[in-house]
């Protein structure tokens, strides 16, 4: 019996289409497969950022795969052909691995890249990113921000920079259509007549960096002799009510502080007849049903009631 062998795929490579980290891994069928013309071969693909302990593994019949990578580091990938047992009248046959790597040739020393990059998606409407210039760079250094997400034909440059002392230190983004729940890629590169500037790459999903507006229209309603219902409204904007968590701070008579986290726009507070003053503030955050992370809003304006009779039906400031 001759041992059945299969070659690895041809032309295995990583292609950078200029999407700032979203890369294509592609290959061609192996040579000498004509004995298995009727057989659908599969490919086992493994890939990772260099330095990562774990490989991502994909088994596919396709000749390409796409995924996002951190371009601050190199990428390594390997692939082999799998001949299923149906094709060989026995056990699965694997080829040797074909391997490839990809990295952006770094320019400049690491200290020249932007520092303290911070991006916030205000009220799920306005993206703003800010940074500090690299360490020891001269004033002639300028940074440029490029971004891409699936749906854009090509990477776009920021058109509305925030400046300080003539240097770009941030970017106000335009309206980003259909940009959430997908990876958002950013590259900040730089130029200087004095020395090369290291590029930085960032990837996040916009729904995870949302900072909502604070809640509005805070009110009190007496529910019973010992209960007061605190109510508020969701902030104006595109975020639906089901996406909010709230944190409340309640102060009774300048002493007792109650903190609570709730999922809807009400909170019932137990009170005593001795309560003379009640104040509360609320802030909002996108919850786990709509994002994996988020940023607390600023606190709302304080709503207080002061007086002798906390038994009135509705207490509005």
């Amino acid at each position: 019996d001759t041992e059945i062998k299969v070659n690895p795929p041809q032309d295995f490579e990583i292609v950078d289409p200029g999407y700032l980290g979203y890369l294509y891994l592609q290959w061609q069928p192996p040579l000498s497969l004509d004995h298995f013309k009727e057989c659908t071969v599969e490919y086992e693909l493994k890939y990772r950022n260099i330095g990562s302990e774990t490989w991502k593994t994909i088994i596919t019949k396709n000749l390409h795969y796409k995924d996002g990578f951190d371009l601050n580091k190199g990428i390594e990938a390997k692939i082999h052909t799998l001949l299923p047992w149906q094709c060989t009248n026995g056990s699965e046959v694997q080829s040797s691995w074909a391997e490839t790597t990809y990295w952006i040739s770094p320019q400049g020393i690491p200290e020249t890249k932007v520092q303290d990059m911070d991006c916030v998606y205000y009220n799920w409407q306005y993206l703003l990113c800010s940074w500090k210039p690299g360490i020891g760079v001269l004033l002639d250094t300028n940074y440029n921000l490029f971004y891409w997400y699936e749906g854009l034909d090509h990477a776009l440059q920021c058109v509305d920079y925030i400046k300080a002392d003539g240097q770009n230190i941030g970017c106000r983004f335009p309206y980003l259509e259909a940009s959430d729940y997908k990876d958002f890629y950013i590259c900040v590169n730089g130029s200087s007549e004095n020395k090369p500037i290291r590029s930085s790459y960032f990837t996040f999903q916009l729904q995870n960096i949302v900072k909502p507006l604070p809640p509005v229209y805070l009110t009190f309603t007496r529910e019973s002799s010992c209960e007061i219902k605190l109510k508020w409204s969701i902030p104006l904007g595109p975020i639906p009510a089901r996406c909010f968590d709230y944190e409340i701070e309640i102060r009774e008579d300048d002493t007792t502080l109650v903190t609570a986290t709730v999922e809807n726009e009400t909170y019932t507070l137990k009170t005593t007849n001795e309560t003379r003053q009640l104040c509360f503030v609320v802030r909002s955050k996108v919850n786990i049903y709509c994002s994996d992370d988020g940023i607390w809003s600023e606190w709302s304006d304080k709503q207080c009631w002061e007086g002798e009779d906390l038994s009135k039906k509705t207490l509005l400031r």
Partner: antibody, heavy 122, light 107 residues
Framework: EVQLLESGGGLVQPGGSLRLSCAAS????????MSWVRQAPGKGLEWVSY????????YYADSVKGRFTISRDNSKNTLYLQMNSLRAEDTAVYYC???????????????WGQGTLVTVSS | DIQMTQSPSSLSASVGDRVTITCRAS??????LNWYQQKPGKAPKLLIY???SLQSGVPSRFSGSGSGTDFTLTISSLQPEDFATYYC?????????FGQGTKLEIK
Amino acid sequence: EVQLLESGGGLVQPGGSLRLSCAASGFTFYSYGMSWVRQAPGKGLEWVSYISGGGSYTYYADSVKGRFTISRDNSKNTLYLQMNSLRAEDTAVYYCARGSYSHYGAHYLDYWGQGTLVTVSS
Amino acid sequence: DIQMTQSPSSLSASVGDRVTITCRASQSISSYLNWYQQKPGKAPKLLIYAASSLQSGVPSRFSGSGSGTDFTLTISSLQPEDFATYYCQQALSSLPTFGQGTKLEIK
């Protein structure tokens, strides 16, 4: 519709250089390997060079190795052939062609440009 | 390098004839063989790939066969537009090579 349009040919002296370009349209350029094939006047076809879709793999005919360099700019959908140390025997029509593969690894040239004439003469 | 030899070098035939062109490889190339048609002043056109697969848009009167070292291109009923030069090309090696061509002329 797949289109390949070569340019850059012309008359050059022996020992001189020339850079051919091939502008591609109508397909996802980075997904395909590309080849240059030449045809001397009144002669048959001679394969010159191949480059994979991402540019990681390049191959050359022995007759041009060390003198010619194939490259591509996927952002511009353009294939190049840099020809140095040109000789009289490099005189030919140069075609760029798109490479495809059958599902079992058979490579073939399924679309060709109309060619550009390179004449090496003193 | 793998050498490809076509025969005949030239061939005269009439419209409606059945024509066969052969191509021999200097070593086994399995079924990694392609056929191209070229008309004067024009670019080559792919007819058959992988020895027997008909390229999309090519008339079914063209067919290819063979494996290993011996291959044939057959035109079942010659049409006026088929008078051209035909080339075989091996694709097993990373250095592809063409046959010298077969010129098909009107008798």
